[in-house]
Amino acid sequence: APTSSSTSSSTAEAQQQQQQQQQQQQHLEQLLMDLQELLSRMENYRNLKLPRMLTFKFYLPKQATELKDLQCLEDELGPLRHVLDLTQSKSFQLEDAENFISNIRVTVVKLKGSDNTFECQFDDESATVVDFLRRWIAFCQSIISTSPQ
């Protein structure tokens, strides 16, 4: 029969695991919100001033199903910031593009971990910034929907 000490330690482990899952869920929701905010701003960027942004190429992972695949998003944050810097105007303003991207990077690292040994396998086909954001929004939504509540 299990002792009271082993029961309490397994309860503590379960609570810790639940807490981690809740935190993970919060980080995913934060990342999703930030990506949706960016996409929304770009799609409303005086509607058709958008084509100037569409000249930039972004790379998507061959397959993204796990949190470690967020390495592929982290690898593309530099180019994403470059696009935001170039497209700042009266009609498209992020108060602080650097800070916005920095916050996304922090969230990504919290989710995937700080281990950078995982090498992203990018798809051969590149994407516009809009398709890139849509793809990562779908990734977040997929992970959130399959996470235990």
Epitope: L48, R52, P79
Partner: antibody
């Protein structure tokens, strides 16, 4: 039908001023960038710059900055390219083109400008 | 200033495959576009965003990209494909640039 119709052939003398036009129809002219492209006789295409008719936001190629002026009148769906003082080296075909999905998808028929010295 | 490099000319016989390349330092991060210009006519967009074909352009026209080089491929070349082909892209400061153009000659 989506189209851009440009003004006709121009024959000018060096030092003259000139304004050529490009009229859009069949789409919302305000919300697409209009680019201007030069093609000198027997040569390739050169991007001159682009204008956004809704607010007249303009971007010039460094090679053409200060040499030409781009403008637009959204009330009559027309973009303009003008010179204050023409030179013989301005002799070329000038095309306007609509910028969509980051490419020039619709082109005008071109305006031939000949400048004699 | 930023340059896109194309071969001046390419010659093929009808029914063969023509490949026209375009090289530029920014191409790993910037999409390329291809235009066809027949003698005495305005240019026509044949490929956008490296690989996409506008409606009305025959399937014989395709585009690909690898590193700093993009390629326009015309399979089963026809006499009517005889034209100048220009690649276009944007430099890092968002200024647009055309390559010098490639004259495609369809032999025979």
């Amino acid at each position: 039908e989506v189209q851009l119709v440009q003004s006709g052939t121009e024959v000018k003398k060096a030092g003259d001023s000139l304004k050529i036009s490009c009229k859009g129809s069949g789409y919302n002219f305000d919300t697409y960038w209009i680019g201007w492209v030069r093609q000198m006789p027997g040569r390739g295409l050169e991007w001159m710059g682009t204008i956004y008719p809704a607010d007249s936001d303009t971007r010039y190629s460094p090679s053409f900055q200060g040499q030409v002026t781009m403008s637009a009148d959204k009330s009559i769906s027309t973009a303009y390219l003008q010179w204050g003082s023409l030179r013989a080296s301005d002799t070329a075909m000038y095309y306007c083109a609509r910028f969509s999905s980051s490419a020039y998808d619709i082109w005008g028929q071109g305006t031939m400008v000949t400048v004699s010295s | 200033s930023y340059e896109l490099t194309q071969p001046p000319s390419v010659s093929v016989s009808p029914g063969q495959t023509a490949r026209i390349t375009c090289s530029g330092d920014a191409l790993p991060r910037k999409f390329a576009y291809w235009y066809q210009q027949k003698s005495g006519q305005a240019p026509v967009l044949v490929i956008y965003q490296d690989t996409k074909r506008p409606s009305g352009i025959p399937e014989r026209f395709s585009g690909s990209s690898s590193g700093t080089t993009v390629t326009l491929t015309i399979s089963d070349v026809q006499a009517e494909d005889d034209a100048d082909y220009y690649c276009q892209s944007a430099d890092r400061s968002d200024s647009y640039v055309f390559g010098a153009g490639t004259k495609l000659t369809v032999l025979g």
